[in-house]
Interface confidence: medium
């Protein structure tokens, strides 16, 4: 494996070469963690402490801001409750989603009193509108956590907000909720560790199952404590959870609770020398690469180890067909708290729990019509027995010999002279971004990873907590507690002044054009373009 970056650029070098633009935050704000990219309007919306920003994608130095603090009374109440006035008693924006063509929906912690509102952004980019709907505030419970330290995953579709968050002051009642819209709110079962066990929510995504929208599912990615008996000792497991978009809750014991919620473990591990696998269980971030078929995105997950002794990070890839296979497999079952988990061998009721009510897969119209035995089974069997293994059964990127850990990932699919390549941009907890290309060997999923660049994007080491990639602008946007940074996806000129250096870099964005290392465009009718990503062989491609 090539673990030495082709380019290693310090923050100073990034600045001097005009390869980073930074917004170093406001004196009265911080926590630039919640990103919403709007390529159409060419804006990056960012939720932070007491503020929401609208940055120009071309140059983030050009921005508008909304100030949305809490009242003095609310702040005092928070302080009296024993909370930190600076770190907790403010409005930390946790949810920022497109609501419709003209408005965003935003929720914040509200100094331990979650609150939501709408932000007007106008019909067209040229309207230049960015303002808070002061007359319309909503209770943010079940949408944003109370505590700014807690992670939230949310998704807003068709006027309904799906949120994985904590619904109480103390951050103990974790649930996946659906709020807004015209239906009664729905949530996961309360007080049942088999459903959720102190989860840390990462992200939520809508994925189609078939051409029938009735089969659409919302997938939640999170990590949680392993349930007793599932693992010896206290352990964390990475999870993928599914919910049918048309789940309106059941009857009897599952009124206003999900009837189609299922979860499975995501495995990201490497075999150890002693026969014991090294597991990367702390899921940190997820990116879905939609290519050609929106029903089958490739899932990229960033994981770290749970151990304090052995620090490591990895990236694993998963296919949705593998995920679906696990959700159609055996349910996890145990007869009592002291028993081992086993695959359920009994009769699974019909329609199979986890199936969406639709004309495609079964003859029932609503989750409210599910038979009693389905409801009873669904309530007590939310977990699948089989885990989801990564493609090729191993990570595509592993880092264990470094003083940092991975925190974020975005991926770009790039057309090169000899095929298409996925370029990963991986954020770390020390404020660096790694640019890694995965190069297929014998098969497309048997990958070699090449570390192209390691870039320091913030002046001080600070954990990267948000990342978005604009293919339109060919720019990467990065968030942290300290501020927001913007950098181009490629710096071809830095690779050197010779064809061989350009070719050896193996950067799919770059090719030798006869006189310089520059951006490669597959449409360019230039016979002189020299590039070899698969092998990085300058002898074959460079005549100088």
């Amino acid at each position: 494996k090539n673990n030495v970056p082709r380019l290693k650029l310090s923050y100073k070098e990034m600045l001097e070469s005009n390869n980073v633009i930074t917004f170093n935050g406001l004196a009265n704000s911080s926590s630039y963690h919640t990103f919403l990219l709007d390529e159409e309007r060419s804006r990056l919306y960012v939720g932070a402490k007491d503020h929401i920003f609208s940055f120009d994608l071309v140059n983030i130095k050009d921005f508008q801001k909304i100030v949305w603090p809490v009242s003095y009374t609310r702040r005092d109440e928070c302080k009296w409750a024993g909370k930190d006035i600076l770190k907790e008693c403010a409005n930390f924006i946790k949810v920022l989603k497109a609501y419709n063509q003209t408005h965003l929906y935003a929720c914040g912690t509200g100094a331990f009193h979650p609150i939501c509102t709408y932000i007007e952004i106008g019909h067209h980019p040229e309207d230049n509108i960015f303002k808070l709907e002061n007359s319309h505030f909503e209770n943010g419970r079940g949408k944003s956590p109370y505590d700014p330290k807690l992670l939230t995953a949310s998704l807003l579709i068709d006027g309904e907000l799906y949120s994985g968050t904590a619904a109480d002051f103390m951050g103990r009642d974790f649930a996946i909720f659906r709020t807004l819209g015209h239906h009664h709110p729905i949530r996961t079962e309360q007080h049942d560790s088999r459903w959720l066990n102190d989860p840390k929510f990462i992200s939520a995504h809508l994925i189609s199952e078939s051409d029938n929208p009735e089969d659409d599912k919302v997938y939640f990615f999170f990590r949680e404590n392993a349930i007793d008996g599932e693992h010896s000792g206290k352990a964390t497991h990475a999870r993928i959870g599914q919910i049918c978009k048309n789940d309106f809750g059941g009857h009897r014991s599952l009124v206003n609770k999900w009837t189609t919620f299922l979860k499975a473990r995501l495995i990201c591990s490497v075999p150890g020398p002693n026969g014991i696998d090294t597991h990367f269980d702390e899921l940190q971030d997820v990116f879905l690469m939609n290519f050609k078929d929106p029903k089958n995105p490739v899932v990229y997950g960033v994981f770290t180890t749970s151990s304090n002794i052995f620090k490591g990070s990895a990236v694993c890839m998963y296919s949705m067909s593998d995920v679906r296979r696990v959700f159609l497999g055996p349910y996890a079952h145990r007869d009592g708290p002291n028993y081992q988990w086993v695959p359920y061998q009994g009769r699974v009721p019909y329609p199979r729990p986890g199936t969406c009510p639709s004309k495609t897969f079964g003859g029932f119209d609503s989750t409210k019509d599910l038979p009693d035995d389905v409801i009873t089974f669904a309530r007590s069997h939310p977990a699948m027995y089989n885990p989801v293994f990564p493609m090729n059964n191993r990570p595509i990127v592993i880092k264990t010999d470094v003083n940092y850990q991975f925190t974020q990932i975005v991926v770009d699919r790039v057309d090169a002279e000899d095929g298409q390549y996925d370029v990963m941009f991986i954020g770390t907890d020390v404020g660096t971004v790694l640019k890694v290309v995965s190069i297929p060997k014998e098969t497309w999923y048997d990958l070699e990873e090449v570390l192209l660049e390691e870039m320091t994007v913030f002046r001080e080491p600070t954990a990267i907590s948000a990342m978005e990639l604009s293919t339109k602008q060919q720019q990467l946007y990065i968030g942290s507690t300290a501020g927001v940074a913007q950098l181009p996806l490629h710096r071809c000129d830095i690779y050197g002044k010779a064809c061989a250096e350009c070719c050896l870099a193996r950067d799919p964005y770059c090719a030798w054009d006869g006189s310089a290392c520059s951006r490669y465009f597959p449409t360019a009718k230039r016979a002189t373009r020299a590039q070899d990503i698969r092998n990085g062989d300058p002898l074959t491609h460079c005549s100088d």
Epitope: D168, M170, D192, R252
Partner: antibody, heavy 123, light 112 residues
Framework: EVQLLESGGGLVQPGGSLRLSCAAS????????MNWVRQAPGKGLEWVSG????????DYADSVKGRFTISRDNSKNTLYLQMNSLRAEDTAVYYC????????????????WGQGTLVTVSS | QSVLTQPPSVSGAPGQRVTISCTGS?????????VHWYQQLPGTAPKLLIY???NRPSGVPDRFSGSKSGTSASLAITGLQAEDEADYYC???????????FGGGTKLTVLG
């Protein structure tokens, strides 16, 4: 029709023990969270303990922690409260109450109550 | 001393409107926890009157209504009737480890 019927109350000396039962009928008992709430003579209501449908979650008021134990037997549709080390201040009518999650989304109300059983702790 | 504060008593003549307040703090009602109201007629068990601050279970007359604002909640009874004479309790949840708390109760007397 939902019915909750408490039994097991009576006179007991300080330091003594008592076991209360609540027989449930008219609903799917195994699906609901259940609670004990008490009311001292001439006083207000005080929540004592709660238990989830599968006994996965159990909680107690600070005033009874370590002395009282809540349990349930779904096969018998019965809720129990084992009370040990009883004190004079535990004297009250003890009600069994069902949590009504379907009505309140986050924090359950008590949608059905039994008629109560009187526990008197006195020497 | 109850966590939620209610007036010990209120009274009103038949046909009148009365309100009962329930004042909490930032760790219960103010933290967004739901508020419920119960009616306890003399010598009987409590009965759910209002759930989730303002919702009536089926069978409860629309003369009873509830509202919530900030750290307080209130119960309003219009067109007072003799059979409304009872004790009324509000309840919510108290952090940090959420458990059920009740108000001290309010005795409603219907005059005349």
């Amino acid at each position: 029709e939902v019915q909750l019927l408490e039994s097991g109350g009576g006179l007991v000396q300080p330091g003594g023990s008592l076991r209360l039962s609540c027989a449930a009928s008219g609903f799917d008992f195994s699906s609901y969270e259940m609670n004990w709430v008490r009311q001292a003579p001439g006083k207000g209501l005080e929540w004592v303990s709660g238990i989830s449908w599968n006994s996965g979650w159990i909680d107690y008021a600070d005033s009874v922690k370590g002395r009282f134990t809540i349990s349930r037997d779904n096969s018998k549709n019965t809720l129990y409260l084992q009370m040990n080390s009883l004190r004079a201040e535990d004297t009250a009518v003890y009600y069994c109450a069902r949590s009504g999650y379907s009505s309140s989304w986050f924090d359950p109300d008590f949608d059905y109550w039994g008629q109560g059983t009187l526990v008197t702790v006195s020497s | 001393q109850s966590v939620l504060t209610q007036p010990p008593s209120v009274s009103g003549a038949p046909g009148q409107r009365v309100t009962i307040s329930c004042t909490g703090s930032s760790s219960n009602i103010g933290a967004g926890y739901d508020v419920h109201w119960y009616q306890q007629l003399p010598g009987t068990a409590p009965k759910l009157l209002i759930y989730g601050a303002s919702n009536r279970p089926s069978g409860v007359p629309d003369r009873f209504s509830g509202s919530k604002s900030g750290t307080s909640a209130s119960l309003a009874i219009t067109g007072l009737q003799a059979e409304d004479e009872a004790d009324y309790y509000c309840s919510s949840y108290e952090g940090p480890n959420p458990y059920v708390v009740f108000g001290g109760g309010t005795k409603l007397t219907v005059l005349g």
